[in-house]
């Protein structure tokens, strides 16, 4: 005996009470695949969630977090409190980044400033809690008369002072 349920498209369910007739999903429910014997209840975006995409007969609602929070987890299963730039979220709430670290986002952790000297460069702009340092040319490149477009000058003779 052929299973008539396999013919039921997404957005319907196979109603065993009605000789396996394909019935549309009731309001606030959906079936995203064919051949379903029940429709799933639509997710409701309430409380800390807000609706990003309404539920339809073939797809579940999608939620976002309300202002002041951001999504965590698959399908925005949780909302995490935002912090200000220059802060990170700890077990005790939002805390300022320690000296030498920064966070330029409302989420995530404070990260160490770039160590310009590791790349042989100098600090052009100091870092803050909100911004990383900006590295500039190497200290050698900043010596008088030096230009990144010209090859390095030959070694000076003893007693010869730079112009």
């Amino acid at each position: 005996l052929q299973d008539l349920c396999s013919n039921c498209p997404a957005g319907t369910f196979c109603d065993n009470n009605r000789s396996q007739i394909c019935s549309p999903c009731p309001p606030n429910s959906f079936s995203s695949a064919g051949g379903q014997r029940t429709c799933d209840i639509c997710r409701q975006c309430k409380g800390v969630f807000k609706t990003r995409k309404e539920c339809s007969s073939t797809s579940n609602a999608e939620c976002d977090c309300i202002s002041g929070y951001h999504c965590l987890g698959a399908e925005c299963s949780m909302c995490e409190q935002d912090c200000k730039q220059g802060q990170e979220l700890t077990k005790k709430g939002c805390k300022d980044c320690c000296f030498g670290t920064f966070n330029d986002q409302k989420r995530g952790i404070c990260r160490p400033w770039t160590n310009c000297s590791l790349d042989g460069k100098s600090v052009l702009v100091n870092g803050t809690k909100e911004r990383d340092v900006v590295c500039g040319p190497s200290p050698a490149d900043l010596s008088p008369g030096a230009s990144s477009a010209t090859p390095p000058a030959p070694a000076r003779e003893p007693g010869h002072s730079p112009q």
């Epitope: 309430k46 409380g47 800390v48 949780m78 909302c79 995490e80 409190q81 077990k91 709430g93």
Partner: nanobody, 116 residues
Framework: QVQLVESGGGLVQPGGSLRLSCVAS????????MGWGRQVPGKEFEWVSG???????DYADSVKGRFTISRDNAKNTVYLEMNSLKSEDTAEYYC??????????WGQGTQVTVSS
């Protein structure tokens, strides 16, 4: 499928008491931190209270000493006992899955109105 069903809200006079309940299903309740939050339309969502899987409780300063959270793992239920209610406690109350800083609201909420 995760489901939270809140109940116990209502109209109460200032100084009165209410007990909210939240029945959970669709996940392993006993291993998860649960809590309560509230929202007044047009205002920020406010975390109210939480209880860890070990039974450690935590409260927002605004409700400390007046509200008591508890859980019954056998019944998959978390409770919020609210005493000495004030008009500023008027809000839609939601059961939460998760801790103080990150959580999900999966229920319809229950309205609490404190008014004389």
């Amino acid at each position: 499928q995760v489901q939270l069903v809140e109940s116990g809200g209502g109209l109460v006079q200032p100084g009165g008491s209410l007990r909210l309940s939240c029945v959970a299903s669709g996940f392993v309740f006993s291993t998860v931190t649960m809590g309560w939050g509230r929202q007044v339309p047009g205002k920020e969502f406010e975390w109210v209270s939480g209880v860890s899987s070990e039974g450690i409780t935590d409260y927002a300063d605004s409700v400390k000493g007046r509200f008591t959270i508890s859980r019954d793992n056998a019944k998959n239920t978390v409770y919020l006992e609210m005493n000495s209610l004030k008009s500023e406690d008027t809000a839609e109350y939601y059961c939460l899955i998760g801790g103080r800083w990150s959580f999900g609201t999966w229920g319809q909420g229950t309205q609490v109105t404190v008014s004389s």
